[in-house]
């Protein structure tokens, strides 16, 4: 009886189970009862990641420098090229098809996590006792100056955007 289902790494064609082509190869011709499936390696610049019966391999992804992209990992016959973004930029999606500039954290916010090639800057509001007076993609919230350790007193309270202003203590006459 002709098979209705085939084993793993096989496919059904003309009532026959044929071997799939292994990763890194493409199909040239289906098996017959006298010859096995004929496969050929993918050409340079192409890949196939799975056991397959495709007559064409897939083109490696192009990391377009005009979009701020560069090659993070060169593709092989079995894997696609992995792109990442140039310094100061990050991917707009998981597929990393284009890049945008890293976000800066506004005054009153500090950098919680510095951006990578694939993730944007994560900002956090400066809590009480901390401030940030710049727009930056790197600066964390800084602690207010401790006037006491300088034998000074607070003349102007700090905010999330400004440091405290210290001044000399009033002399007792």
């Amino acid at each position: 009886e002709p098979p209705t289902a085939c084993r793993e790494k096989q496919y059904l064609i003309n009532s026959q189970c044929c071997s799939l082509c292994q990763p890194g190869q493409k199909l040239v011709s289906d098996c017959t009862e006298f010859t096995e499936t004929e496969c050929l390696p993918c050409d340079s610049g192409e890949f196939s990641a799975q056991w397959n019966r495709e007559i064409r391999c897939h083109q490696h992804k192009y990391c377009d420098p005009n979009l701020g992209l560069r090659v993070q990992q060169k593709g092989t016959s079995e894997t696609d090229t992995i792109c990442t973004c140039e310094e100061g930029w990050h991917c707009t999606s998981e597929a990393c098809e284009s890049c945008v500039l890293h976000r800066s954290c506004s005054p009153g916010f500090g950098v919680k996590q510095i951006a990578t090639g694939v993730s944007d800057t994560i900002c956090e509001p400066c809590p009480v006792g901390f401030f940030s007076n710049v727009s930056s993609a790197f600066e964390k919230c800084h602690p207010w100056t401790s006037c006491e350790t300088k034998d000074l007193v607070v003349q102007q309270a700090g905010t999330n955007k400004t440091d405290v202003v210290c001044g000399p203590q009033d002399r007792l006459r």
Epitope: P2, N14, V28, S29, T32, E33, F34, T35, E36, E38
Partner: antibody, heavy 117, light 107 residues
Framework: EVQLLESGGGLVQPGGSLRLSCAAS????????MSWVRQAPGKGLEWVSG????????SYADSVKGRFTISRDNSKNTLYLQMNSLRAEDTAVYYC??????????WGQGTLVTVSS | DIQMTQSPSSLSASVGDHVTITCRAS??????LNWYQQKPGKAPKLLIY???SLQSGVPSRFSGSGSGTDFTLTISSLQPEDFATYYC?????????FGQGTKLEIK
């Protein structure tokens, strides 16, 4: 016991025709692909043609394509090779063989075809 | 068609010898190769299939190896009944094709 018995060989003139038969026994004939392989005197083996178990698939060597036809009658457990427009270079011993998973595991004893004027 | 080239074409050896016959394909055929033995006036007999699998009933002194384009048939200790002609046959691409044969003779 698997047995394959060829018949139908003989002397034929160039341009003539001949039909070879291969009687099979000892196995479920319809479940197996079959083939014909030939061997010219003092030469090596040449795969000539093959046919699937259900007759749905046939294949031929380029040297015989358009001249030879393979067929089978599963009700009679018999394989055939119809040879037309025979040439001197078709002179050979013709073997029928059973196919099992891409290899020929049983062979007949062969039948000699001589094409000569 | 894929060309199969066997070497040597003929070989003289003695009983007890270790013998290696090679078969080269004109393009990669993975492990899709069979070996047959033929004695004069007889039909071929299957020895090895899928490059290295021993056919049932064939003595274990016969072994096959290789993949891609280069294959070998090895007889570990020649016996008198092993003197014959050996053929490789590929099934990686249609049509199946045989090597030209290697004749193994008594020295």
């Amino acid at each position: 016991e698997v047995q394959l018995l060829e018949s139908g060989g003989g002397l034929v003139q160039p341009g003539g025709s001949l039909r070879l038969s291969c009687a099979a026994s000892g196995f479920t004939f319809s479940s197996y692909a079959m083939s014909w392989v030939r061997q010219a005197p003092g030469k090596g083996l040449e795969w000539v043609s093959g046919i699937g178990g259900s007759s749905s698939y046939t294949s031929y060597a380029d040297s015989v394509k358009g001249r030879f036809t393979i067929s089978r009658d599963n009700s009679k457990n018999t394989l055939y090779l119809q040879m037309n427009s025979l040439r001197a270079e078709d002179t050979a011993v013709y073997y029928c063989a059973r196919y099992y998973s891409y290899h020929m595991d049983y062979w007949g004893q062969g039948t000699l075809v001589t094409v000569s004027s | 068609d894929i060309q199969m080239t066997q070497s040597p074409s003929s070989l003289s050896a003695s009983v007890g010898d270790h013998v290696t016959i090679t078969c080269r394909a004109s393009q990669s055929i993975s492990s899709y190769l069979n070996w047959y033995q033929q004695k004069p006036g007889k039909a071929p007999k299957l020895l090895i299939y899928a490059a290295s699998s021993l056919q049932s009933g064939v003595p274990s002194r016969f072994s096959g190896s290789g993949s891609g384009t280069d294959f070998t048939l090895t007889i570990s200790s020649l016996q008198p009944e092993d003197f014959a002609t050996y053929y490789c046959q590929q099934y990686g691409s249609a049509p199946p094709t045989f090597g030209q044969g290697t004749k193994l003779e008594i020295k």
